[in-house]
């Protein structure tokens, strides 16, 4: 533990996994659910102006894109990859990029991605071949 760091009661809040340094949680876009204009694009920006320090050091960035007959929404949050989100396991939680994967949901089109780089859920990718290009 670094000098003067108090002993933590809750180890989820303090991660010390290399040489005693304490790890800052990830920085993620965190706008919860917002209406989105992202549709039929290979990639999109979240248009979320809020970047939050995640609550726990092991949380990653998540984005959820949903389309139904009424609207399109994009959800941006932090989430623990050990826990499911919307009933689904967070795949590729260690990825530096947020590459959307379609999930089966009745009555809507549902894509979700997770990633573990600063603000990585700001740029969501629907085509894996498109990862090196700039957003539409």
């Amino acid at each position: 533990i670094p000098p003067h760091v108090p002993k933590s009661v809750n180890s989820d809040v303090m991660a010390s996994d290399n040489g005693g340094a304490v790890k800052l949680p990830q920085l993620c876009k965190f706008c919860d659910v917002r209406l989105s204009t992202c549709d039929n694009q290979k990639s999109c920006m979240s248009n979320c102006s809020i970047t939050a320090i995640c609550e726990k050091p092991h949380e990653v960035c998540v984005a959820v894109w949903r389309k139904n007959d009424k609207n399109i929404t994009l959800e941006t949050v932090c989430h623990d990859p050990k826990l499911t989100y919307h009933g689904f396991t967070l795949e590729d939680a260690a990825s530096p990029k947020c590459v959307m994967k379609e999930k089966k949901r009745a009555g809507e089109t549902f894509f979700m991605c997770a990633c573990n780089m600063e603000e990585c859920n700001d740029y969501i990718i629907f085509s894996e071949e498109y990862t090196t290009s700039s957003p539409d």
């Epitope: 670094p2 000098p3 290399n18 340094a21 304490v22 790890k23 800052l24 949680p25 970047t51």
Partner: nanobody
Framework: EVQLLESGGGLVQPGGSLRLSCAAS????????MAWVRQAPGKGLEWVSL????????YYANSVKGRFTISRDNSKNTLYLQMNSLRAEDTAVYYC????????????WGQGTLVTVSS
């Protein structure tokens, strides 16, 4: 030797304000990210706010966003946390922390300053 010395804590009523300071020495202050972290009684550490070397960007935990403001004066080697609209749940020991220069790791911490929000 790296030293971080927090001050400005105390007892304040709900809705009140406090300004914490952290005087830094022993390293090139204007080259490092700095953060405020707190520990409420019986709880784990909670990261409150982060600031980059030149003062921008700044980041906040959702629990304090819109109420707390982090800033720094590199000419004085000092980090600040302006806390407004304080709530009972903000009661904690507040620590300033220095970025290690690698990954997301912070390696030096102050002794802390106690903030008590109570009527």
């Amino acid at each position: 030797e790296v030293q971080l010395l927090e001050s400005g804590g105390g007892l304040v009523q709900p809705g009140g304000s406090l300004r914490l300071s952290c005087a830094a020495s022993g390293f090139t202050f204007d080259k490092y990210k700095m953060a405020w972290v707190r520990q409420a009684p019986g709880k784990g550490l909670e990261w409150v706010s982060l600031i980059f070397p030149n003062g921008v960007p700044t980041y906040y935990a959702n629990s304090v966003k819109g109420r707390f403001t982090i800033s720094r004066d590199n000419s004085k080697n000092t980090l600040y946390l302006q806390m407004n609209s304080l709530r009972a749940e903000d009661t904690a020991v507040y620590y300033c922390a220095k970025y290690s220069g690698q990954g997301r790791d912070f390696d030096y911490w102050g002794q802390g300053t106690l903030v008590t929000v109570s009527s």
